[in-house]
């Protein structure tokens, strides 16, 4: 199949990093500067992504692969491929329209991004609070008093945290 295809379409012989140049009798020409082709047989090369301003270059563009951006220090990426940058806050805070604000009592955030989430309600599982929660950490639930018999497990890990939402700029 490959041989048949190459007989029919000379462009299929052009490797990644080149394009099939119609202006030059379908010769394989190297991708021009600031462009790339990640697969063979391309009739054009794609423009490289540019990382400027709040974005910084994580991976340089090459003739065969696109540039990759991430955010400058103090920011984190939002969206697939880092399409936007959002300011970091400290643990124990969340980003609001008025900037980074401490988590309200009864909530916590153990990351530099995302929203403050309510402490786990141990009593819903019939357990008691073993370690109090803080702005930065969830409570740790322990066994209920009735479970405190020899050989009983002493600590239950907290419920898994929900995926943090995207908080306002």
């Amino acid at each position: 199949f490959e041989r048949t295809r190459s007989l029919q379409d000379p462009c299929s012989n052009c490797p990644a990093g080149t394009f099939c140049d119609n202006n030059r009798n379908q010769i394989c020409s190297p991708c021009p500067p600031n462009s790339f082709s990640s697969a063979g047989g391309q009739r054009t090369c794609d423009i490289c992504r540019q990382c400027k301003g709040v974005f910084r270059t994580r991976k340089e563009c090459s003739s065969t692969s696109n540039a990759e951006c991430d955010c400058t220090p103090g920011f984190h990426c939002l969206g697939a491929g880092c399409s936007m940058c959002e300011q970091d806050c400290k643990q124990g805070q969340e980003l609001t329209k008025k900037g980074c604000k401490d988590c309200c009592f009864g909530t916590f955030n153990d990351q530099k991004r995302g929203i403050c989430r309510p402490w786990t309600n141990c009593s819903l599982d019939g357990k008691s609070v073993l370690v109090n929660g803080t702005k930065e950490r969830d409570v740790v639930c322990g066994p209920s008093p009735a479970d405190l018999s020899p050989g009983a497990s002493s600590v239950t890990p907290p419920a898994p945290a929900r995926e943090p939402g995207h908080s306002p700029q």
Epitope: I47, G53, M84
Partner: antibody, heavy 115, light 107 residues
Framework: QVQLQESGPGLVKPSETLSLTCTVS????????VHWIRQPPGKGLEWIGA???????DYNAAFISRVTISVDTSKNQFSLKLSSVTAADTAVYYC?????????WGQGTLVTVSS | EIVLTQSPGTLSLSPGERATLSCKAS??????VSWYQQKPGQAPRLLIY???NRYTGIPDRFSGSGSGTDFTLTISRLEPEDFAVYYC?????????FGQGTRLEIK
């Protein structure tokens, strides 16, 4: 709260220099850059250029010979200067914070170029 | 520069209907397309970033899709406040560019 506000003369004579300022609050000028974007009456949006948090600039090639964007951190202001203006430069001029997708804009200021 | 072409130029629909707006790029821009809503006398407002991510506070009737050169903004059920001009913009390569806009008007 993040706020940007453009200001400057609403009327500029042809061949003169248009000067606008973008006064910001709610964020640090050393952390964020700003873009300038304009919109002629009844038309679409056109990117003029940007100044980054480190002070370097990028301009649209269509304006590069007559545009200057600068920052005055002491006044919390960015500025745009566009020289040798013509009637075609009549537009609403916006500044927008650099976050990768223009989430925060000023309200815009209309500049009319006329003698 | 990358040219973004929006269609249709004007879309006439009634509240409750579904709106589909198109944006085509002259080059591959990955998923680095944003959508903005603009009402008369106001600045544009970010709706969608990264082709499909709803920005904070944007109702879930707004959704974006696409990658490469073809992008779509869908408003699933039009509310009276949705009638406005919509722009797509690319943040992939400089100079940053915008489409010419689609006017969404009440039928």
């Amino acid at each position: 709260q993040v706020q940007l506000q453009e200001s400057g003369p609403g009327l500029v004579k042809p061949s003169e220099t248009l000067s606008l300022t973008c006064t910001v609050s709610g964020f640090s000028l050393t952390t964020y850059g700003v873009h300038w974007i304009r919109q002629p009456p009844g038309k679409g949006l056109e990117w003029i250029g940007a100044i980054w948090s480190g002070g370097s600039t990028d301009y649209n090639a269509a304006f590069i010979s007559r545009v200057t964007i600068s920052v005055d951190t002491s006044k919390n202001q960015f500025s745009l200067k566009l020289s040798s203006v013509t009637a075609a430069d009549t537009a609403v001029y916006y500044c927008a914070r650099d976050d990768g997708s223009f989430a925060n804009w000023g309200q815009g200021t209309l500049v009319t170029v006329s003698s | 520069e990358i040219v973004l072409t929006q269609s249709p130029g004007t879309l006439s629909l009634s509240p409750g209907e579904r709106a589909t707006l198109s944006c085509k790029a002259s080059e591959n821009v990955g998923t680095y397309v944003s959508w903005y809503q603009q009402k008369p006398g106001q600045a544009p407002r970010l709706l969608i970033y990264g082709a499909s991510n709803r920005y904070t506070g944007i109702p879930d009737r707004f959704s974006g899709s696409g990658s490469g050169t073809d992008f779509t903004l869908t408003i699933s059920r039009l509310e009276p406040e949705d009638f406005a001009v919509y722009y797509c913009g690319q943040t992939y390569s400089y100079p940053l560019t915008f489409g010419q806009g689609t006017r969404l008007e009440i039928k």
